[in-house]
């Protein structure tokens, strides 16, 4: 897993940026873990970044992700945490110029290097669930969420609202 200095260096620059015509409401660095307290980690392997879900050793530092929050510009009937039909969306960046992307064809979650404006595949609708957990729904594919499968992140189709509480699509965010 790599450090967060790169993220910290460009956090301020992002505040002034405009992504798909809108600026983030707020941004902050947080570690991402599963409902069962496994950490989401990122590693550079063969010139590309891999995403892992793993138990960290006691004193091992958690990787941080820069979360940028946006308000959807157009009203929506989706079930995100919105009032008056608008939703909160988020992008997740673990290191400079790389963002989590939904690859709907492969049902995978990947880290892609890209320039702004970010593609829709980098945006996820934020849902706030019980125990202050969150889930991330693909903007490009409603009903499909980031989830955990075989110690990796994957895209998981959620068929009904009852399955929104399925543990494998619930994540915890922590600033500590």
């Amino acid at each position: 897993a790599f450090g967060i200095s790169g993220v910290q260096k460009y956090t301020r620059a992002l505040h002034d940026s405009s992504i798909t015509g809108i600026s983030p409401i707020t941004e902050y660095l947080a570690s991402l873990s599963t409902y069962n307290d496994q950490s989401i980690t990122f590693a550079l392997e063969d010139e590309s970044y891999e995403i892992y879900v793993e138990d960290l050793k006691k004193d091992e530092k958690k990787d941080k992700v820069l979360l940028s929050y946006y308000e959807s510009q157009h009203p929506s009937n989706e079930s995100g945490d919105g009032v008056d039909g608008k939703m909160l969306m988020v992008t997740l960046s673990p290191t400079k110029d790389f963002w989590l992307h939904a690859n709907n064809k492969e049902h995978s979650v990947e880290l892609h290097k890209c320039e702004k404006p970010l593609p829709d595949q980098a945006f996820f609708v934020l849902h706030n669930m019980h125990s202050n957990c969150v889930s991330f729904e693909c903007k490009t594919d409603p009903g499909v969420f980031i989830g955990v499968k075989d110690n990796h992140l994957a895209l998981i189709k959620v068929d009904s609202s009852e399955n929104l509480c399925t543990e494998n699509i619930l994540f915890k965010l922590s600033e500590t």
Epitope: T26, Y28, D81, N128, N132, S174, E175
Partner: nanobody, 124 residues
Framework: QVQLVESGGGSVQPGGSLRLACAAS????????AGWFRQTPGKEREFVAS????????NYADAVKGRFTISRDNSKNMMYLQMNSLNFEDTAVYYC?????????????????WGQGTQVTVSS
Amino acid sequence: QVQLVESGGGSVQPGGSLRLACAASGRIFVISNAGWFRQTPGKEREFVASISRHGEITNYADAVKGRFTISRDNSKNMMYLQMNSLNFEDTAVYYCATTLGHSPRTDPGDFDSWGQGTQVTVSS
């Protein structure tokens, strides 16, 4: 901007308990740090407790440590303050507030949305 409404205030005897609730409307509550403050007549608003966006970081004023507990439920857009072992010095109007700034926050000036307040009176 978040709209905040406090409830749960009232009169209680020394040693008693109250649970304050803060109902938030506005989608950005869930990405806001939040806190409780209190004010007595003629004095400045003072920090009581604060909580991070997802509840994992909490801070308390020395005067309430061990007696008060702050919590939140983002799925309901709610924040709470459980107040135990109340004493006369806890009598005040209690306000909830939120900020998009980074936690921890204890200065009232850092908070941009405020409720109208709820009165807590400790008397025998």
